[in-house]
């Protein structure tokens, strides 16, 4: 166990031009906080995805309105540092997302509004125990300086917060079995300490704060003998003793999700469902209210206005979960047509369109032939996002204004043949089809394998292009 | 992606007329060969007549100097006067749709006509 600490030093305009307007003014004064999440692991998720390490809020910091005319300063920060404590191992590799929020203190209905000014991510290798590393970090034309660290909560000690060290009980040397704890030589390695009721007689333990049963035994305490009556549970191995399987710990035993929160078991750990009021990895942050801006991603609080009253988040599109923390991904439904590529913009969903298709989903197919002329006689076909023109007899380009072969094009459909001819252009078509250029199959179903000439046509006459 | 829906079928006499249309979406008439098919039960689906994207008209035998097919461009729309209807033009009628850039084809969904008395 131990404690994840964050110091915010500045957040202000970064280096070079085009510095950001101010995010306070005189009619609209606010002030800002931070948020952190971490998760474990070099990882590439998404900023929505769970703050499996755990997550924190900063105190609000002073208000600030914006002098008129002057540049926008550094702007004054909240005191104190952010703490996200863990309760397992510190992974060494880690996540990080930093939000920076601003409040705005008009007078808007329904209290204070928050949004979001700038979000930093990251990832970094960290020991526990080492030194405050610094950090700077830029988002569109802001910058954030910030330090932390990782430190172990006593008795846990070591880089990953796993080793437990204990005062030694005798001046010369540790107890029988015990190391020293480097580096604190005047304490010793202490027993692992198994979850707390953890039965002494038939559980054990190879990780702090775990019960694991020895053969026969049960239960997230290890309490519960397993009769050959009850062999119902798939999970673990056979029983020699017992014929029964017997259930190796899963991760909901013993409910980790504290305040009456439910488990759920997920292919990797256990997911908690918290109540109203209560949140992060295990319920454990209680007592949050409106006043603690627990809604993300601009979500609109109401109610809770003291710790023992629920709070609601009304989230803005493209946000949802009880906090607003989850991003919907609205392109996961693919809503644009025709081939075009979809952008969540958070706010609003966009669709770039494919060349001749628009609209908002690019479901207008665009007529390209609009204001466009085709010479010698020529008829603007569209499509494709490029007008083209059909031209008459002897005329060929984009525009008909070259001379050319008018079979060139083919212009018959379905395999009919193409002729120049004085007084047009001819297709003669395939057994099967009719029309000016072979276009309409007789019988679709099966137009080829049709004898020849079907009773009352004759297909294979040519049918003049006038 | 052309869309083509029909409307206008429905019972008629002997000797009596309708008028089949078929609203075009995705891209303009115009620039189309339409034509309307039909599909008697048991039997394979048949052309009746179409119209090129330059105007010219083809027609099968059976209903030549009874059945006109037609565009509006402006409604952008395509349509099938049937009279002096007979039994045998009992069927689905469907639109089709041919476009000359992709050369691909595209279907309605079709509409009832049936002729009795």
């Known amino acids: 166990a131990g404690v994840f600490e964050l110091q915010i030093h500045s957040f202000g305009p970064g280096p070079g031009p085009g510095a950001p307007r101010s995010p306070c003014s005189a009619r609209l004064p606010c002030r800002l906080f931070f948020r952190v999440c971490l998760k474990p692991g070099l990882s590439e998720e998404a900023a929505e995805s769970p703050c499996a390490l755990g997550a924190a809020l900063s105190a609000r910091g002073p208000v600030y309105t914006e002098q008129p005319g002057a540049p926008a300063p550094d702007l004054p920060l909240p005191d104190g540092l952010l703490q996200v404590p863990f309760r397992d191992a510190w992974p060494g590799t880690f996540s990080f997302i930093i939000e920076t929020w601003r409040e705005e203190l008009g007078d808007q209905i329904g209290g204070p509004a928050w949004s979001l000014l700038a979000r930093v991510a990251g990832r970094r290798r960290l020991a526990a125990g080492g030194p405050w590393a610094r950090d700077i970090q830029r988002a569109g034309a802001w910058e954030l300086r910030f330090s932390y660290r990782a430190r172990c909560e006593p008795p846990a000690v070591g880089t990953a917060c796993t080793r437990l060290c204990r005062p030694r009980s005798a001046p010369s040397r540790c107890g029988p079995g015990l190391r020293p704890c480097a580096p604190l030589e005047d304490e010793c390695e202490a027993p692992l300490v198994c979850r707390a009721g953890c039965s002494p007689e038939h559980g054990f333990c190879e990780q702090p704060g775990e019960c694991r049963c020895l053969e026969g035994w049960t239960g997230p305490l290890c309490t519960v003998p397993v009769s050959t009556s009850s062999c119902l549970s798939p999970r673990g191995p056979s029983s020699a003793t017992t014929g029964c399987l017997v259930p190796g710990p899963g991760p909901c035993d013993g409910n980790p999700c504290a305040n009456g929160g439910s488990c759920s078991e997920t292919p990797r750990s256990f997911e908690c469902t918290c109540p109203r009021g209560f949140y992060g990895l295990r319920c454990e942050v209680s007592g949050v209210t409106c006043a603690d801006g627990p809604c993300f991603n601009g979500g609109l609080c109401v109610g809770g206005a003291d710790p023992d009253s629920a709070y609601i988040c009304h989230c803005p599109p493209g946000f949802q979960g009880s906090n607003c923390e989850k991003r919907v991904d609205r392109c996961s439904l693919q809503p644009c047509r025709n081939g075009g590529l979809c952008l969540d913009l958070g706010h609003a969903l966009r669709c770039r369109c494919r060349a001749g298709f628009a609209g908002p989903r690019c479901e207008h197919d665009l007529d390209d032939c609009a204001g466009r002329a085709c010479a010698n006689g020529g008829t603007c076909v569209e499509g494709g996002g490029a007008h083209r023109c059909s031209c008459a007899l002897g005329f060929g380009g984009r525009d008909c204004r070259e001379r050319a072969d008018p079979c060139a094009a083919r212009p018959c459909a379905h395999g009919g043949r193409c002729y120049a001819h004085f007084s047009g252009l001819v297709c003669a078509c395939a057994p099967g089809y009719m029309g000016a250029r072979c276009e309409f199959p007789v019988h679709p179903d099966g137009a080829s394998a049709l004898p020849a000439a079907p009773p009352g046509l004759r297909p294979g006459d040519p049918q003049r292009y006038l | 992606e052309v869309q083509l829906v029909e409307s206008g079928g429905g019972l008629v006499q002997p000797g009596g007329s309708l008028t089949l249309s078929c609203a075009a979406s995705g891209s303009s008439v115009s620039n189309l060969s339409m034509a309307w098919y039909r599909q008697a039960p048991g039997k394979k689906r048949e052309l009746v007549a179409g119209?090129?994207?330059?105007?010219?008209?083809a027609y099968i035998d059976s209903v030549k100097g009874r059945f006109t097919i037609s565009r509006d461009n402006a409604k952008n729309s395509v349509y099938l006067q049937m009279n002096s209807l007979r039994a045998e033009d009992t069927a689905v009628y469907y639109c089709?749709?041919?476009?000359?850039?992709?050369?691909?084809?595209?279907w309605g969904q079709g509409t009832l006509v049936t002729v009795s008395s």
């Open positions: 119209i090129s994207a330059d105007g010219s008209t």
């Open positions: 089709y749709a041919y476009r000359w850039t992709t050369r691909r084809t595209y």
